[in-house]
């Protein structure tokens, strides 16, 4: 017997649908109506035929009461080819829901997104996460999607993007965005970061994650942040192959004084990089290739320093830095 495509847990909290049949019974998803967190995986299906069955131009207000009754706070949609018109139709209807977090993964968005009608209500998301989503519209996709969202977005995550650079002149500011995660875009690089960090469009960023993004030096990242006017409190550069030395011809970069936490773990560093901020609350240098204990003059003034998992650290040796957070146990790096 074929397993049920949708499973709702016994607490009405989590509902997961895996539609793998060529002609799935979408009505099965109705059992998710009382779930708080919903995941729908469409098995790579092309949802184009849906456009014939739904009126994408219908006034979504007619569904308002039905949608308001949904408990869903977090929705994940994955593995499908979705016409932009259908995506927009869904966003318009979900604007009447309690949805706060939306994740789109492994999607191919086809066609262009129509402009937001004057009477339409934007979706009041606090978090939007995109992973491996391709858009037919290329660089303008963020601006097109943004118009369907209210301006209160706090968390934006874009991974495995086909076009991580945005059409900055079309993008409006994200006034409430405090966390931007561009991790897992290995082709981004420092020049790409400059293109992605549209100047003055991210005025409230506190946390910036750039894991596995092809960054080369902390100084290069500093320059990109300075150019964009982005002043994060916390910066994650882990899982990049970082060079410790700075190009002598490159101008010195002054880090923002707002930065107090820097993650340089898993960065292949054989020595402490030059050009780090002068003062930090947290510096993570764990799981690098440091062959000797860093000298005080190589390090910023730092409250919490993590050096676990470096070759020079033999379990049980004295901690190399006052106030460090080393456990004395080499983690699995």
């Amino acid at each position: 017997t074929t397993p049920e495509p949708c499973e709702l847990d016994d607490e009405d909290f989590r509902c997961v649908c895996n539609f793998s049949e060529p002609q799935p019974d979408w009505s099965e998803a109705f059992q998710c109506v009382s779930a708080v967190e919903v995941e729908i995986h469409a098995g790579g299906l092309n949802l184009e035929p849906f456009l014939k069955r739904v009126d994408a131009d219908a006034d979504p207000r007619q569904y308002a009461d039905t949608v308001k009754a949904l408990r869903v706070r977090r929705l994940t949609v994955g593995a499908a080819q979705v016409p932009a018109q259908l995506l927009v139709g869904a966003l318009r209807v979900l604007a009447y829901s309690r949805l706060k977090e939306l994740t789109l993964e492994d999607l191919k968005i086809t066609g262009t997104m129509p402009p937001l009608p004057l009477e339409a209500t934007g979706l009041a998301l606090s978090s939007l996460r995109l992973r491996n989503v391709s858009w037919a519209t290329g660089r303008s996709w963020l601006a097109e999607l943004q118009q369907w969202l209210k301006p209160g977005l706090k968390v934006l995550s874009i991974a495995q993007a086909h076009s991580p650079a945005f059409s900055c002149e079309q993008v409006r500011a994200f006034p409430a965005l405090t966390s931007l995660d561009l991790s897992d875009n290995p082709g981004l690089g420092e020049r790409g970061l400059m293109a992605a960090l549209c100047p003055h469009k991210f005025p409230a960023i506190q946390n910036l994650a750039l894991r596995n993004t092809g960054m080369e030096t902390p100084t290069g990242v500093c320059a990109a942040l300075a150019a964009a006017g982005v002043q994060p409190h916390s910066l994650d550069l882990s899982h990049n192959s970082l060079r410790a030395t700075v190009n002598p011809s490159a101008p010195r970069c002054m880090w923002s004084s707002a930065l107090n936490s820097l993650n340089l773990s898993f960065a292949g560093l054989e020595q402490v990089p030059k050009g780090l901020p002068a003062k930090l609350r947290v510096l993570d240098l764990s799981c690098n290739r440091l062959n000797r204990a860093p000298q005080p003059d190589e390090l910023p003034e730092v409250d919490n320093l993590t050096l676990d998992g470096n070759p020079f650290l033999v379990p049980g040796t004295a901690l190399p830095h006052e106030g460090s957070m080393n456990s004395g146990v080499v983690p699995a790096c």
Partner: antibody, heavy 115, light 111 residues
């Protein structure tokens, strides 16, 4: 059998940050459900503080949102509560609880805010 | 926020009596076919214990003298034959919409 156990200091000074940890055994905090903090001031009713879900998503009571952070350590199967800028009004028994119909409770820990 | 108002705030009844506690919500706590209203019993110095979930479902291990009913905004907890061990404070709680809220409690005593 699922068990939850709260731990943390029983006395916190005004204006400081209250920090509690809940250790879960008999179930994984990253596989399902919501993992909540609920408090009860002495002789008063129950107040939901917030949750962190199996996915890492959080939801907070708006009345406390500006002061609350709930986080988790999946490697230790623990979730934690931080409540900043505490006053005497935050004196309460703090419970960690599983689900949104609250079927599994820790035994509770009394936190007193006093100088 | 959804406000839950319990009545009475306290009550005294004799062993064997049928006891009813009501809970009224400021707006509907129904989502489609389910009412997300639950009932708890709390004894002094102990954590609350789930009695009834989704308005009418008896939690495993709870005596069958406890029952629940209601939908949308009006709900009832009934103890068909009061026992001495039922002395406690009873709370209703909604999980239809965050913030998840509790009633103010009903203190039940034996005459």
């Amino acid at each position: 059998q699922l068990q939850l156990q709260e731990s943390g200091p029983g006395l916190v000074k005004p204006s400081e940050t209250l920090s509690l940890t809940c250790t879960v055994s008999g179930g994984s905090i990253s596989s399902d459900s919501a993992w909540n903090w609920i408090r009860q001031p002495p002789g008063k009713g129950l107040e939901w503080i917030g949750y962190i879900s199996y996915s890492g998503s959080t939801s907070y009571n708006p009345s406390l949102k500006s002061r609350v952070t709930i986080s988790r350590d999946t490697s230790k199967n623990q979730f934690s509560l931080k409540l900043s800028s505490v006053t005497a009004a935050d004196t309460a028994v703090y419970y960690c609880v599983r689900g949104l119909r609250f079927a599994y409770w820790g035994q509770g820990t009394l936190v007193t805010v006093s100088s | 926020d959804i406000q839950l108002t319990q009545s009475p705030s306290s009550l005294s009844a004799s062993v064997g009596d049928r006891v009813t506690i009501t809970c009224r919500a400021s707006e509907s706590v129904d989502s489609y076919v389910n009412a997300f209203l639950h009932w708890y019993q709390q004894k002094p110095g102990k954590a609350p214990k789930l009695l009834i979930y989704r308005a009418s479902n008896l939690q495993s291990g709870v005596p069958s003298r406890f029952s629940g009913s209601g939908s949308r905004t009006d709900f009832t907890l009934t103890i068909s034959s009061l026992q001495p061990e039922d002395v406690a404070t009873y709370y209703c709680q909604q999980s239809n919409e965050d913030p998840y809220t509790f009633g103010q409690g009903t203190k039940l005593e034996i005459k």
